[in-house]
């Protein structure tokens, strides 16, 4: 997520993906600023301020800052623009900074919902975190119940949200099988994809797990999961829904 | 791609070329047999209609891309909070009419998982058929180049992008310039390798010129959008 979270001074800051932020990640910038940038062709006008150039094939209307998506096109900024730009930006920069700071706080505090309430995308209503992933749909679109599973970290560790504890926990490998893996992949959005499900040693130091209650009968996978502080196999589920991220070079290396 | 090299077959198997009117317009990244990640600015009106788009996968040369070999697009989903002026939330999804068949030359890239840590100057790669010099033409062959992530704090400094970078963006390149994405690379991948797996870190979005000093490439920060992506995939069908 490209936010610099604090980390040991010797190593310096990291880009960390916190994942599962309340939507939408970042508010549009304040109305005073957007007038400054307009989509514009791929030409450069030397200036202390960047030409804003989306990298796509584009042409456009009278710019203030030349905005260039990264896709081919062409037109140049005039020096008038440059002057207007400097004035607007001095003002703009301050306002953007303030608005971004406020906007981010607002977003990270749980959108327009107070405390850690969760907003339903479909209706904009707020629901209590204890009702999120509790097996009962509280959002009209059911999104409080279909975002209860995620893959975590570079080892694809399957985590399930506990509405009791209001936090994510790895799934213990005990009694886990491929069918559950397929169901979890489906719930994440991988309709017809499933690659592998295996137990890996949990090196995260987790002391809290979600375990399968095998006697729960033929019910929804999440209704079978219960909270446990122990995992006898000492392994957590690593789930890959799709054989991704392998190119010819890396497949050669891995042989 | 400026300052890159032509790609070998299968090196970037998730890279697609997105055509309108038989012209390469944007790049994209395969994430499942049916779904492509690209940039929202690629699909601004009137190009939000799916039938305008044809995706080509596993083909390195533009001249080998003809309509019958392409994949028609069924659906175009632009991020609801995309801002065309600031390029904030510059990400979109395309669903293909029929699923891609994976092989050595056509494979998906991994979406980043929450909890993944990247070094401030993580080594990454960019690829695409964009211009190989500023104001240049689209490239006939797929090119790729090595770039480094640039911390947002540094990228937002007064001498670089002066607070234009939001947390939904990520900068990559070199402050001395020379290597960068360029026009025509939009929507394409910024990837990094971790645990011998390639992860989609960004989608090519914008920049000031191409490969200029203190003007690195700016990419949509895919890490921020993984939940939104999964939600679109879930909601579909």
């Amino acid at each position: 997520m490209a936010l610099n979270s604090g980390s040991p001074p010797a190593i310096g800051p990291y880009y960390e993906n916190h994942g599962y932020q309340p939507e939408n990640p970042y508010p549009a910038q304040p109305t005073v600023v957007p007038t400054v940038y307009e989509v514009h062709p791929a030409q450069y006008y030397p200036s202390p301020v960047p030409q804003y150039a989306p990298r796509v094939l584009t042409q456009a209307s009278n710019p203030v800052v030349c905005t260039q998506p990264k896709s081919p096109s062409g037109t140049v900024c005039t020096s008038k623009t440059k002057k207007a730009l400097c004035i607007t930006l001095t003002l703009g920069t301050f306002l953007v900074g303030a608005a971004l700071a406020a906007g981010l706080l607002w977003k990270f505090m749980g959108s327009k919902c107070s405390n850690s309430g969760i907003e339903c995308d479909s209706s904009g209503t707020c629901i209590n975190p204890s009702n999120w992933c509790d097996g009962v749909s509280h959002c009209p679109g059911g999104e409080d119940e279909n975002r209860c599973v995620r893959l975590y970290g570079p080892n694809f560790i399957l985590q399930v949200y506990s509405s009791q504890r209001k936090s994510w926990h790895p799934v213990c490998q005990d009694d886990w099988n491929e069918a559950y893996g397929r169901a979890a992949c489906r719930d994440m959005g991988y309709k017809n994809n499933f690659y592998s499900s295996q137990g890996i040693v949990d090196d995260s130091g987790s002391t809290s797990f979600m375990k399968l209650n095998t006697s729960a009968g033929n019910v929804d996978i999440y209704k079978k999961l219960y909270h446990s502080d122990a995992c006898s196999s000492k392994a957590v589920v690593s789930l890959r829904c799709i054989a991704c991220g392998v190119n010819l070079n890396s497949s050669r290396q891995s042989r | 791609i400026v300052g890159g090299e032509s790609a070998l077959p299968g090196a970037w198997p998730w890279q697609v070329s997105l055509h309108v009117q038989n012209v390469h317009v944007c790049g994209g990244s395969i994430i499942t047999p049916e779904w492509i990640v690209t940039a929202a600015h690629c699909v601004e009106k009137p190009l939000n209609n799916p039938w305008h788009w044809t995706a080509f996968a596993g083909i390195l040369r533009q001249s080998f891309m003809f309509y019958g070999a392409g994949y028609q697009v069924e659906k175009v989903i632009s991020h609801p909070n995309y801002d065309s002026k600031t390029k904030n939330n510059d990400i979109a999804l395309m669903k293909l009419q029929k699923p891609l068949t994976f092989n050595d030359l056509v494979k998906p890239v991994c979406l980043p998982n929450p909890g993944m840590m990247l070094q401030p100057e993580q080594l990454c790669w960019i690829s695409g058929w964009g211009a190989t010099e500023e104001k240049g033409k689209t490239s006939e062959v797929l090119n790729a180049a090595k770039v480094l992530l640039i911390e947002t704090q540094r990228c937002n400094s007064r001498y670089v992008y002066d607070n234009l970078i939001t947390p939904a963006m990520i900068c990559a390149g070199f402050l001395q310039g020379n290597v960068d994405s360029c026009q025509g690379d939009s929507g394409g991948p910024l990837v990094t390798s971790k645990n011998n797996i390639w992860w989609l870190i960004g989608d090519t979005s914008w920049g000031s010129g191409c490969a200029k000093a203190y003007r690195p490439g700016v990419y949509g920060n895919v890490m921020v959008f993984t939940d939104w992506i999964y939600r679109q995939m879930r909601a579909d069908g």
């Epitope: 796509v56 094939l57 584009t58 042409q59 456009a60 896709s71 081919p72 096109s73 | 309108v20 009117q21 038989n22 012209v23 317009v25 009106k45 009137p46 190009l47 209609n49 799916p50 039938w51 305008h52 044809t54 309509y67 019958g68 028609q72 069924e74 659906k75 009419q97 029929k98």
Partner: antibody, heavy 117, light 112 residues
């Protein structure tokens, strides 16, 4: 070679429905979008809608949304257009046409629909 | 909705003459990404289905005689037949595909 075959004529009564067909051959049916176009006697061409044979994704001209329904049968490489609640106003020649990029490169011969009691 | 206007609605010329017909759209049909226009010309001979002549405003479809030329950009387009032949008797339609699809009213070409 590419061919789009349509029956020459259909005669139906007012208030009824009709399903017009367009059988494609000579190319990969599921690769190309298919369009339907109407031409009333002595009039110009009007775009009705578009369908993709692989997924069945459709898009309609607002004017025809409640009148026309597009479907396909992949197994027989045939596109269909159902027209409902027919009146004499619906009497016209109906064409199917294949989309290449953003233009119609092949057209069927057209079906003349006559709505009459 | 984009409105397509064609003029004249009909014209009569002798074989061998040069003919131009106009098509105007209510908004620009230029795709700034590809620098091509979303405009095509079709020929419909009496009793036949339409046939593609020109696409992207100026690209001639293969097999179309080179006496047919499309030109223009943005909102104003022209179809020119440099030397009309008897078999060119037809109605000519322009069509936009910038936003959905709309045909012009047609120009009827008659041979004197």
């Amino acid at each position: 070679q590419v061919q789009l075959q349509q029956p020459g004529a259909e005669l139906v009564k007012p208030g009824a429905s009709v399903k017009l067909s367009c059988k494609a051959s000579g190319y990969s049916f599921t690769t190309y979008w298919m369009h339907w176009v109407r031409q009333r006697p002595g009039q110009g061409l009007e775009w009705i809608g578009i369908i993709h044979p692989n997924s069945g994704t459709t898009n309609y001209n607002e004017k025809f949304k409640s009148k026309a329904s597009l479907t396909v049968d992949k197994s027989s490489s045939t596109a269909y257009m159902q027209l409902s609640s027919l009146t004499s106003e619906d009497s016209a020649v109906y064409y199917c046409a294949r989309l290449l990029w953003d233009y119609f490169d092949y057209w069927g011969q057209g079906t003349t629909l006559t709505v009459s009691s | 909705d984009i409105v397509m206007s064609q003029s004249p609605s009909s014209l009569a010329v002798s074989a061998g003459e040069k003919v131009t017909m106009s098509c105007k759209s209510s908004q620009s049909l230029l795709n700034s990404r590809t620098r091509k226009n979303f405009l095509a010309w079709y020929q419909q001979k009496p009793g036949q289905s339409p046939k593609l002549l020109i696409y992207w405003a100026s690209t001639r479809e293969s097999g179309v005689p080179d006496r047919f030329t499309g030109s223009g950009s943005g909102t104003d387009f022209t179809l020119t037949i440099s030397s009309v032949q008897a078999e060119d008797l037809a109605v000519y339609y322009c069509k936009q595909s910038y936003n959905l699809y709309t045909f012009g009213g047609g120009t009827k070409l008659e041979i004197k």
